[in-house]
Interface confidence: low
């Protein structure tokens, strides 16, 4: 592969737990500047697999509230704005990186931690098993 | 509001960027411990609304590799199996945080940022717009 | 039921200076981390400034540093935001919000208040 050189300007890594610490700035860069949130905001009431965003807040982590969903029905909503039983609202989930303050309650201390979270549903065709 | 007690063995924060500039583990902390990525992903095939992976990968991110999302067609997949151009497959977005090499090439040293990934697809019921 | 209404907004010409308010009702306000944020016409959703809840803490993001700064008063319950040396490129609605801004929902919005930097 392609090796990139060591940018001579990098702080010192003298830290005994390099490279496991590293420095991390939290003034957060928003590459999403061409995106309108709110373009995709009603989604979760316009969908055959309508959820609810649940809040899910923890002030030892960062960021301190994510956002949850919950699927409305187990079925799939139809044409004639019933529920179709025979397909099935499922979350779709993905995992995320977060901060973890740790030692716990320290301002500029966090560890990376992975979480799944739900980020919307989606209607399936279910998997049907066949009893002999 | 609740204010929670300093740790006192938190690290110093002497230095003068604090507390926008902390000290984070990348010894990841895994909380999905009891979840089974597996079952979730033939999602994107049963989908009434679709969607292909494609990989991203960037060197100078952590995570360097990131899934998108791109639905595979512009309405849902009908019980005949067919595309119904009446419903719209549209893509569930979120902002994660990711860590960007800042300077660039450093091992060390990253900058927060945040990007919008498409997770999957969804199908919704289109918003027509009437001319009068 | 929660209510955030700004004000301050107007035409201004480049240099000019704007303070903009947000008055909050409905919650404890002190106990909330608060958000300046705008829409420029035909763009996304930018955020602008944040403060913590007890006003120790204030972020920028890199575009208006040195030249907006946010405040708050918690026995008014008001968000402000004082811009100096607007440019053309700060024309937008900016809306205070109560909530995380990440992801992409916040709990709750005001209804926004028009700059526009213009000569």
């Known amino acids: 592969g392609i090796t990139i050189p060591r940018n001579p300007g990098c702080p010192n890594s003298e830290d005994k737990n390099f490279p496991r610490t590293v420095m991390v700035n939290l003034n957060i860069h928003n590459r999403n500047t061409n995106t309108n949130p709110k373009r995709s905001s009603d989604y979760y009431n316009r969908s055959t697999s309508p959820w609810n965003l649940h809040r899910n807040e923890d002030p030892e982590r960062y960021p301190s509230v994510i956002w949850e969903a919950k699927c409305r029905h187990l079925g799939c909503i139809n044409a004639d704005g019933n529920v179709d039983y025979h397909m099935n609202s499922v979350p779709i989930q993905q995992e995320i990186l977060v901060l973890r303050r740790e030692p716990p309650h320290c301002p500029n201390s966090f560890r990376l931690e992975k979480i799944l979270v739900s980020v919307g549903c989606t209607c399936v065709t279910p998997i049907v098993h066949h009893v002999a | 509001g609740i204010t929670i007690p300093r740790n006192p063995g938190c690290p110093n924060s002497e230095d003068k960027n604090f507390p926008r500039t902390v000290m984070v583990n990348l010894n990841i902390h895994n909380r999905n411990t009891n979840t089974n990525p597996k079952r979730s992903s033939d999602y994107y095939n049963r989908s009434t609304s679709p969607w292909n992976l494609h990989r991203n990968e960037d060197p100078e991110r952590y995570p360097s590799v990131i899934w998108e999302a791109k639905c595979r067609h512009l309405g849902c997949i009908n019980a005949d199996g067919n595309v119904d151009y009446h419903m719209n497959s549209v893509p569930i977005q979120q902002e994660i945080l990711v860590l960007r090499r800042e300077p660039p090439h450093c091992p060390n040293s990253f900058r927060l940022e945040k990007i919008l990934v498409s997770v999957g697809c969804t199908c919704v019921t289109p918003i027509v717009h009437h001319v009068a | 039921q929660v209510q955030l209404v700004e004000s301050g907004g107007g035409l201004v010409q480049p240099g000019g200076s704007l303070r903009l308010s947000c008055a909050a009702s409905g919650f404890t306000f002190s106990s909330y981390g608060m958000y300046w944020v705008r829409q420029a016409p035909g763009k996304g959703l930018e955020w602008v400034a944040k403060?913590?809840?007890?006003?120790?803490?204030?972020y920028y993001v890199d575009s208006v540093k040195g030249r907006f700064t946010i405040s708050r008063d918690n026995a008014k319950n008001s968000l402000y935001l004082q811009m100096n040396s607007l440019r053309a490129e700060d024309t937008a609605v900016y809306y205070c919000?109560?909530?995380?801004?990440?992801?992409?929902?916040?709990?709750?919005w005001g209804q926004g208040t028009l700059v526009t930097v213009s000569s």
């Open positions: 403060i913590e809840q007890d006003g120790s803490e204030e």
């Open positions: 919000a109560k909530g995380e801004i990440l992801p992409l929902y916040f709990d709750y």
